[in-house]
């Protein structure tokens, strides 16, 4: 992994002044052994509002790896394979927990951060707006 | 939100010896205002594949909510507004973190934990088994 | 329809910073992935940063990574670019653009950013 | 990085006959995964913004005229014009973009 140099400003573990604080263990207990979005189904490519995926890392957040997907197409294919522009491919999106190191650098201390991640993508009826 | 009792048994912040552990901020800097999936948008109403969203509590679970979604249908939404059983409507799942209050009760001690959630649904193409 | 429109240009100091922005209308903005590109005076089309769609993932060319920060306001349909301890070399006129998917299908008109002391 | 490489970077062309500038990229811009070819065409007009003209190789973008081409594979693409009118006059971009995005120099196309 990549070695962070550590900040000489991390607050103290014992200090309980820290806001509103807990003590977390990192030891995983995962019920999924499959890390990697690509490999857990092939849905993506079956779609018919198919995605990629996108990797991006961030050594300041943990997970530090997210994945996060990308529709392929504005429309959605069809039965003969085509894109069809009378439907939309949108990304389904999902608020996800993720640990900040706060201050930056710290390898004991974080902070909860929600972020918003799109997960995959579906084929929905556009809406169509009438002038009147 | 819930009172949970503390269990008496519940291990001291400052025990060196409790398996690597990290201080965590519960404040959670929140990117995204939406915290209903069903606000977010209707895709999952005017998607090919529809779902809806089950509600799913837990105490022990940080956060206590996160919702599920279930397809509708097995196969898919055609143009007609009919299912389509050529097509199927499969579940995009996705990791997420959660903390659970470890040992149970205690209010301020967590083990990271990795569920599997179903996100949305999307239609694929079947995968077709010919038989020799 | 969709329309892009840049703002935040100017004349500005070798080592100083700006912010431009990009309002954004006539298409639902949280489903897009935005990017920003750069065409120096009477040179070719350079790319600068990317965002998600949700603004979780960015992506920067070495040129101006750890200067430049990409970043939006889902709520308010506006796609930033903030420029840190800016160059002579910066000196280009900023294009936003909308990722259609793989390929960017709407550009605004661009917002002049000009180093020099 | 993958390196785009247009030709000609100039090209004197006459109204009514065809026009076609080459695009090679320093590794493949096929994926086999999704069986598509991540490049596309832009034309910038003078004094104007670029606006697209061909993704994925070969698909035209809405509004543009039939005139307009793409074709190509892996490594090597091609923009043709059938019959370049007055208005084609521009500088003509190719474009990869993945996870990065990278741009051809442009081929300036002028009437004679």
């Known amino acids: 992994g990549i070695t962070i140099p550590r900040n000489p400003g991390c607050p103290n573990s014992e200090d309980k002044n820290f806001p509103r604080t807990v003590m977390v263990n990192l030891n995983i207990h995962n019920r999924n052994t499959n890390t990697n979005p690509k490999r857990s189904s092939d849905y993506y490519n079956r779609s018919t509002s198919p995605w990629n995926l996108h990797r991006n890392e961030d050594p300041e957040r943990y997970p530090s790896v997210i994945w996060e997907a990308k529709c392929r197409h504005l429309g959605c294919i069809n039965a003969d394979g085509n894109v069809d522009y009378h439907m939309n491919s949108v990304p389904i999106q999902q608020e996800i927990l993720v640990l900040r190191r706060e201050p930056p650098h710290c390898p004991n201390s974080f902070r909860l951060e929600k972020i918003l991640v799109s997960v995959g993508c579906t084929c929905v009826t556009p809406i169509v707006h009438h002038v009147a | 939100g819930i009172t949970i009792p503390r269990n008496p048994g519940c291990p001291n912040s400052e025990d060196k010896n409790f398996p690597r552990t990290v201080m965590v901020n519960l404040n959670i800097h929140n990117r995204n205002t939406n915290t209903n999936p069903k606000r977010s948008s209707d895709y999952y109403n005017r998607s090919t594949s529809p779902w809806n969203l089950h509600r799913n509590e837990d105490p022990e679970r940080y956060p206590s909510v996160i919702w599920e979604a279930k397809c509708r249908h097995l196969g898919c939404i055609n143009a007609d507004g009919n299912v389509d059983y050529h097509m199927n409507s499969v579940p995009i799942q996705q990791e997420i973190l959660v903390l659970r209050r470890e040992p149970p009760h205690c209010p301020n001690s967590f083990r990271l934990e990795k569920i599997l959630v179903s996100v949305g649904c999307t239609c694929v193409t079947p995968i077709v088994h010919h038989v020799a | 329809q969709v329309q892009l429109v840049e703002s935040g240009g100017g004349v500005v100091q070798p080592g100083r910073s700006l912010r431009l922005s990009c309002a954004a209308s006539?298409?639902?903005?949280?489903?897009?992935?935005m990017t920003w590109v750069r065409q120096a005076p009477g040179k070719g089309l350079e790319w600068v940063a990317s965002v998600s769609n949700t603004g979780s993932s960015t992506y920067y060319p070495a040129s101006v990574k750890g200067r430049f920060t990409i970043s939006r306001d889902n709520s308010k349909n506006t796609l930033y670019l903030q420029m840190n301890s800016l160059r002579a070399e910066d000196t280009a006129v900023y294009y936003c653009?909308?990722?259609?998917?793989?390929?960017?299908?709407?550009w605004g008109q661009g917002t002049l950013v000009t180093v020099s002391s | 990085d993958i390196v785009m490489t247009q030709s000609p970077l100039s090209l004197p062309v006459t109204p009514g006959e065809p026009a076609s500038i080459s695009c090679k990229s320093s590794?493949?811009?096929?994926?086999?995964?999704?069986?598509?070819?991540?490049l596309a065409w832009y034309l910038q007009k003078p004094g104007q913004s670029p606006q697209l003209l061909i993704y994925?190789?070969?698909t035209r973008q809405s509004g543009v005229p039939d005139r307009f081409s793409g074709s190509g594979s892996g490594t090597d693409f091609t923009l043709k014009i059938s019959r370049v009118e007055a208005e084609d006059v521009g500088v003509y971009y190719c474009?990869?973009?993945?996870?990065?995005?990278?741009f051809g120099q442009g081929t300036k196309v002028e009437i004679k």
């Open positions: 994925y190789a070969s």
């Open positions: 653009a909308r990722e259609g998917a793989y390929y960017l299908d709407y």
């Open positions: 474009h990869h973009h993945y996870d990065s995005h990278t």
């Open positions: 006539g298409f639902t903005f949280n489903n897009y992935w």
């Open positions: 590794q493949s811009l096929f994926w086999s995964e999704s069986h598509m070819n991540y």
